[in-house]
């Protein structure tokens, strides 16, 4: 094949090599960019910055090599458009540092940075951690910090992510209240901070205030839906990111629902209770307190992480006719109480008959399973009905 005269030449089915001295100063408008999986760049002393726009449209890129060039700066979001990138070789450039954000979200199997005049500061703590943990082939490179020494020796005692403290109101919060949260951010080299409120939806009207190092958040006219929803404060510095989540407890009165008894492994009278704080429960059977035993007991289902409502069952292990009757669930918390009742019939009473009525017995003269000619009682196979009154 004839030698390629261009700055960048195809290499294999989906690769591109750019090795002609000084031909590039940016990566805009590379030919066939959208299908590239491999990009090799060498001897480009004018290529000094790598930014978000440079790699736009290179969504299939897996291997990127920029070596023996003039690269001085790689933007924290440079690889936003190349989420499949797994090999990154930036050796023998002029990089003094590389932000943790640059590689965040990538699954890099290999990261090569040797031959750069790296400068050790807390901003390279993430890279030191990669070296310690054997990630990305970093340990083999024995990275040096220019003028200082091996990256492995960099002191890191003061290289922490920000520390966050979120103050929530001590007092009880009621539906309709306004709530002020404050996030206090401490640490060196603070860069950005904010709130994540994705779970809140219609739970309150949100107003943000303040900035580093003290962020305010007002949740106005809160609803009971705010319970169990995470309000998250985050902050970033050159070392990394920290997040702290809190929940605001909005008080509201107890409520309860009962449903038709269903036969599972045991019988179950399903219920749902809600309220904040979580209500205390008590069962009544035919108006009297029901003392729970190993045969009749309350069982809760695994609660959903983001709601206060609890679902469960009153479990009845092989109930008989003596368990038929009216079941009432009482729920109470400091803000109110509620009850719901339901009739449950588990079995007909076998002794409810008139002595003058004939005993319901059937004879099976051809019954081969019977060892004697004794009569065999036949169970009533008619399904019984349960009427439900949901309170």
């Amino acid at each position: 094949a004839a030698p390629c005269p261009d700055a960048c030449c195809p290499h294999g089915s989906s690769g591109l090599r750019c090795t002609r001295d000084g031909a590039l100063d940016s990566l805009h408008h590379l030919p066939g960019a959208e299908n590239l999986t491999e990009l090799y760049i060498e001897n480009q002393q004018h290529l000094q910055h790598l930014e978000l726009r440079d790699l736009r449209g290179l969504g299939e890129l897996r291997n990127l090599t920029i070596v023996k060039s003039g690269l001085r700066f790689v933007a924290p979001d440079a690889f936003h458009f190349t989420p499949r990138l797994s090999r990154l070789n930036l050796s023998f450039n002029a990089l003094e540092s590389l932000s943790w954000k640059t590689v965040q979200g990538l699954s890099l199997q290999e990261l090569v940075l040797s031959g750069n005049p790296l400068h050790c500061s807390c901003a390279l703590r993430w890279l030191q951690r990669w070296e310690e943990e054997g990630l990305g082939g970093v340990p083999e490179q024995k990275l040096q910090c220019h003028g200082q020494g091996p990256l492995a020796h960099m002191p890191n005692a003061s290289c922490g992510v920000p520390t966050l403290k979120v103050q929530v109101p001590n007092a009880s919060v009621d539906v309709g209240d306004d709530v002020l949260l404050r996030c206090q951010v401490e640490g060196r080299g603070l860069e950005q901070a904010g709130w994540i409120l994705t779970e809140l939806e219609q739970s309150a009207t949100v107003m943000k205030s303040g900035g580093l190092p003290s962020l305010g958040l007002t949740l106005a006219n809160v609803t009971s839906d705010l319970n169990r929803k995470n309000v998250t404060c985050w902050a970033e510095n050159d070392v990394g990111r920290a997040e702290v989540s809190v929940q605001v407890n909005v008080s509201f009165p107890a409520s309860v629902q009962l449903h038709t008894a269903v036969e599972m492994h045991h019988w179950c009278i399903p219920f749902s209770v809600d309220g904040q704080p979580a209500p205390s429960l008590r069962w009544l059977f035919n108006g009297s307190v029901l003392n729970e035993t190993s045969f009749i007991f309350t069982e809760f289902l695994e609660p959903a992480a983001n709601e206060t409502v609890r679902h469960g069952c009153l479990r009845l292990n092989q109930p008989t006719h003596v368990n038929n009757g009216n079941y009432t669930l009482l729920a109470a918390n400091p803000f109110g109480q509620a009850s719901a009742s339901i009739m449950a019939a588990f079995m007909d009473n076998p002794f409810e008959f008139n002595p003058e009525d004939p005993i319901p017995v059937s004879f099976s003269p051809v019954d081969t399973n019977s060892t004697s000619g004794d009569p065999v009682e036949k169970k009533d196979e008619t399904p019984f009905g349960v009427s439900v009154a949901v309170g």
Epitope: S121, H146, Q148, G149, P150, H153, P155, C159, R188
Partner: antibody
């Protein structure tokens, strides 16, 4: 023990060059970066540049770029700093200092070399 | 370049006094160094990465701080402590020094 011994005082004319030496002993010379710092009379400390004797890698403060040359001779464990196009404001005490990466600081300093630039 | 501002530029104190020197960086730094220099002598390392004592440095010297604000404290000033003290950062190139604080006898 670790020692850095510098060459003696120099008097130079403006426009001339000066070459200061720094002989290291008591440690492996090629393992640690050697830095050069200067101090004008009655003034504070000013970083000039650094050399890695293991491979001659260098870095300089922008201010001295193009005017300072850092070299080393591994056979004698000696680092050199040459400053050209001297001006009167280059009159200062020039120090070499080792960056000790085990504890991450400039732990040992030479005794200093006084360079006077005067017509 | 990161600028290092020391205060005060000079102070007079008596033996036994507690002395505090502050150093402020123009932007947040990872750690700080302190040096002591006596007339005609090379700087002597006192404190490395913010709070660790250099070899042979008496325990009356201590360093603290984070971000942009750092402090060198001499808990009980001794006759041999009268000197000029410099702070130095190396969070980014080039390493830069404070202007110095001269501690004189009152």
């Amino acid at each position: 023990q670790v020692q850095l011994v510098q060459s003696g005082a120099e008097v130079k004319k403006p426009g001339a060059s000066v070459k200061v030496s720094c002989k290291a002993s008591g440690y492996t010379f090629t393992t640690y970066w050697m830095h050069w710092v200067r101090q004008a009379p009655g003034q504070g400390l000013e970083w000039i540049g650094t050399i890695y004797p293991g491979n001659s890698d260098t870095s300089f403060a922008q201010k001295f770029q193009g005017r300072v040359t850092l070299t080393r001779d591994t056979s004698t464990s000696t680092a050199y700093m040459e400053l050209s196009s001297l001006r009167s404001e280059d009159t200062a005490v020039y120090y070499c200092t080792r960056f000790y990466f085990e504890d991450w600081y400039f732990d040992v300093w030479g005794q200093g070399t006084t360079v006077t630039v005067s017509s | 370049d990161i600028q290092m501002t020391q205060s005060p530029s000079s102070l007079s104190a008596s033996v036994g006094d507690r002395v505090t020197i502050t150093c402020r960086a123009s932007s947040s730094i990872s750690w700080l160094y302190w040096f002591q220099q006596k007339p005609g002598k090379a700087p002597k390392p006192l404190i490395y990465y913010t709070s660790s004592l250099g070899s042979g440095v008496p325990s009356r010297f201590s360093g603290s701080g984070s971000g942009t604000d750092y402090t060198l404290t001499i808990s009980s000033l001794q006759p041999e402590d009268f000197a000029t003290y410099y702070c130095q950062q190396w969070h980014s190139y080039p390493p830069t020094f404070g202007g110095g604080t001269k501690v004189e006898i009152k």
